[in-house]
């Protein structure tokens, strides 16, 4: 950013710097050769997060609950609301204006990382020697039960979407 | 009182640099700004740019960036305004101003005038 | 940029008149208007700064007016030491754009 005419914390105006508003205030009347800038702290709904000259403060967010969202972080003069989902939802997008259900992870699947507020559940096939017979949001793959140290043997070979079937050993005559 | 008064008239050549002075006086020099202006033959007003005699920083007009370069010194309470090479398009009357809400004392004036 | 317009670029009036000066800028300025006067021998002086505000020194048959995007600048009681061309200037946005000026003459 080159020099300009006026310091940090300044703007130009009318061949002058004024200081600029500090956060949680706004621009009421810019000053003049005789008068210092004058600013008004922004009202309890409403917030500026830098030092500005803006006339207007800023809504802060609404955390909608018929879009699934509730207030995380409760907004100030100086920050805006931070909204999240409810349980079980997570953020369609990085503003986080609405939710959507958590997806689970089919049959096959297994959970890598469970959901929070701002991801989605993100799945992972099960490898072999591992399965998963549900659609769940919280399941990860299981391991195949281990028939020999039950003193069983394979009767079923598993699958990515079902267990070993286990029995018993064949006797010799 | 307050004073601005400038360098005289130049004749120069196409091609070349000058560089116009402006020196105040009744006031604290580094508390305000000062403007430069130009004004061809018969013609308006055009901002060039300004200066914080402070700390030098400067705002330009886009159309004279490249062409004006603004500075300060402190010590003598004086502005400068070089214009670098120059063409018949440059002959004006150039005027330095103390700024703090508006233009609020201007320099004489200084003619520039650029002819082989 | 802001455009700054003077639609009256020279003016006739007799010596006593009261005359108004108009200027339109091509958006809102807030009021950051400030007028000028240039006599004959070149010399600039700030009249009135902030729409109304005399500058020191100037005589009070000087005003001026406006808002918005729409200023005027009045002579209450010309006298002859007013013949000038007068701009007006917009302080609210760089870069700074002054009026194409208005020249008042003596009928």
């Known amino acids: 950013e080159p020099p300009t005419a006026c310091r940090e914390k300044q703007y130009l105006i009318n061949s002058q710097c004024c200081s600029l508003c500090q956060p949680g205030q706004k621009l009421v009347s810019d000053c003049t050769e005789f008068t210092e800038t004058e600013c008004l702290p922004c009202s309890e709904s409403e917030f500026l997060d830098t030092w500005n000259r803006e006339t207007r403060c800023h809504q802060h967010k609404y955390c909608d609950p018929n879009l699934g969202l509730r207030v995380q972080q409760k907004g100030t003069s100086e920050t805006d609301t931070i909204c999240t989902c409810e349980e079980g939802l997570h953020c369609m997008s990085e503003s986080c204006e609405s939710c959507v259900p958590h997806r689970s992870c089919l049959p096959g699947f297994g959970v890598k990382q469970i959901a929070t507020g701002v991801s989605d559940t993100i799945c992972e096939p099960c490898p072999v020697g591992f399965f998963s017979n549900v659609s769940s949001a919280f399941e990860k793959c299981r391991p195949w039960t281990s028939c020999e140290t039950k003193d069983l043997v394979v009767q079923q070979a598993g699958t990515n979407k079902t267990d070993v079937v286990c029995g018993p050993q064949d006797r010799q005559r | 009182q307050v004073q601005v008064q400038q360098s005289g008239a130049e004749l120069v050549r196409p091609g070349t640099s000058v560089k116009v002075s402006c020196k105040a006086s009744?006031?604290?020099?580094?508390?305000?700004?000062i403007e430069w202006v130009k004004q061809r033959p018969g013609q308006g007003l055009e901002w060039i740019g300004v200066?914080?005699?402070?700390?030098?920083?400067?705002n330009y007009n886009e159309k004279f960036k490249g062409k004006a370069t603004l500075t300060a010194d402190k010590s003598s309470s004086t502005a400068y305004m070089q214009l670098s090479s120059l063409t018949s398009e440059d002959s004006a009357v150039y005027f330095c101003?103390?700024?703090?809400?508006?233009?609020?004392?201007w320099g004489q004036g200084t003619l520039v005038t650029v002819s082989a | 940029h802001i455009q700054m317009t003077q639609t009256t670029s020279s003016l006739s009036a007799s010596l006593g008149d009261r005359v108004t000066i108009s200027c339109r800028a091509s958006?809102?300025?807030?009021?950051?208007l400030n007028w000028y006067q240039q006599k004959p021998d070149g010399t600039v002086k700030l009249l009135i700064s902030?729409?109304?505000r005399l500058h020191s020194g100037v005589p009070s048959r000087f005003s001026g007016s406006g808002s918005g995007a729409d200023y005027s600048l009045t002579i209450s009681n010309l006298e002859q030491e007013d013949i000038a061309t007068y701009f007006c200037?917009?302080?609210?946005?760089?870069?700074?754009?002054f009026g194409g000026g208005t020249k008042l003459e003596i009928k």
């Open positions: 009744g006031y604290a020099f580094t508390n305000y700004l």
């Open positions: 200066i914080n005699p402070e700390f030098g920083g400067t």
């Open positions: 902030y729409t109304s």
């Open positions: 958006q809102d300025i807030s009021s950051h």
């Open positions: 101003a103390r700024g703090g809400g508006g233009f609020t004392y």
């Open positions: 200037q917009q302080g609210n946005t760089l870069p700074w754009t």
